[in-house]
């Protein structure tokens, strides 16, 4: 029985040009988490595997960084960054975990005096 | 077997500059963040930084800005850190580590350094 | 940056016996904590990976609880070779940090 749950930042605004955490927290179970994927809709953006670390798709490679922990940063937002992402757990013996995060960049000056939810 | 291989013993003089080296074997360097954490003698563990030689990204200890410069050649498969303008206090032994994302899972085995005139 | 506190700073106790160990942070960092043993001029080894999950190659008698800002490593029956310290450390944010350290000694 699957007795996880994801807790995850939720809807989340970030000013474009600036950088953002995504973040996903498993919580009340104690299967090994063996890999985390984090996806922008249909599109893989990294993965993070137990055995064989961080792996960033060649596309977004100059624009993630990985980490802290098994979060991700996206750097240099756009516009077109606005949408929906999605953490992945795969555990074992639970199976998937999945966590949604929901991202507005907002041009500057609306970030500055609308944004909630903002990381620093 | 994974292995992070620190450069040796340093003793420098006050002002002056070292930079160490963590050679790796046996892991895709380019998928891990490596951490260079700082311990002086019978004290605890303190967090420097971190780079992550898959984009060159790095992340510093406020307090270590400006103090350690952290560096890597992923041709080489090897992590630097320079410490510069040396003081007593800057006498430690520096461990480098990898992260995955799972914990800091593999630790060299230490480069003891000492400020001394 | 987040502080992580630990209690006790030292422990005595003799083999066999069954100990827990305290990491406090000063704001939640879900399960984003991790425990280290470093014994006498070694470099530390992780024990315990996200507060509860073991990690391959550490004894069974070592295992990790907690969530939030309040973690507990217990060992199960101390051995001798388990006399060291034991440090946690966060990766919920950057700066990561580290605990102050708890002495586990024998009585």
């Known amino acids: 029985m699957m007795t996880g749950t994801i807790e995850t930042t939720g809807n989340i605004s970030a000013e474009k040009g600036g950088s953002i955490i995504l973040q996903c927290h498993l919580s009340s179970t104690t299967a090994q988490v063996t890999q985390v994927n984090w996806e922008q809709q249909d599109q893989l953006l990294a993965i993070c595997n137990a055995d064989l670390g961080w792996h960033i798709s060649p596309s977004f490679k100059d624009r993630v960084a990985p980490g802290p922990g098994l979060g991700l940063t996206l750097q240099s937002l756009t516009v077109n960054d606005t949408g929906e992402y999605f953490c992945i757990y795969h555990t074992y013996p639970d199976g998937t975990y999945t966590g949604r995060i929901f991202l507005e960049v907002l041009e500057s000056s609306v970030a500055e005096h609308g944004a909630r939810f903002q990381i620093p | 077997e994974v292995q992070l291989q620190q450069s040796g013993t340093v003793l420098a003089r006050p002002g002056a500059s070292v930079k160490m080296s963590c050679k790796t074997s046996d892991y895709s360097f380019t998928s891990y963040w490596m951490h260079w954490v700082k311990q002086r003698p019978g004290q605890g563990l303190e967090w420097i930084g971190a780079?992550?030689?898959?984009?060159?990204?790095?992340r510093y200890n406020q307090k270590f800005k400006g103090k350690a410069k952290l560096t890597a050649v992923t041709s080489a498969n090897t992590a630097y850190m320079e410490l510069s303008s040396l003081t007593n206090e800057d006498s430690a032994v520096y461990y480098c580590?990898?992260?995955?994302?799972?914990?800091?899972?593999?630790w060299g085995q230490g480069t003891s350094v000492t400020v001394s005139s | 940056d987040i502080v992580l506190t630990q209690s006790p700073a030292t422990l005595s106790v003799t083999p066999g016996d069954s100990v827990s160990l305290s990491c406090r942070a000063s704001?939640?960092?879900?399960?984003?904590l991790h425990w280290y043993q470093q014994n006498s001029h070694e470099s530390p080894r992780l024990l315990i990976k996200?507060?509860?999950q073991s990690i391959s190659g550490i004894p069974s008698r070592f295992s990790g609880s907690g969530s939030g800002t309040d973690f507990t490593l217990s060992i199960n029956s101390v051995e001798t070779e388990d006399f060291g310290l034991y440090f946690c450390q966060q990766s919920n944010s950057w700066p990561y940090t580290f605990g102050g350290g708890t002495r586990l000694e024998i009585n």
């Open positions: 704001q939640s960092i879900y399960n984003n």
């Open positions: 780079i992550y030689p898959g984009n060159s990204a790095a």
């Open positions: 996200y507060a509860s």
């Open positions: 580590s990898r992260e995955g994302g799972y914990g800091l899972d593999y």
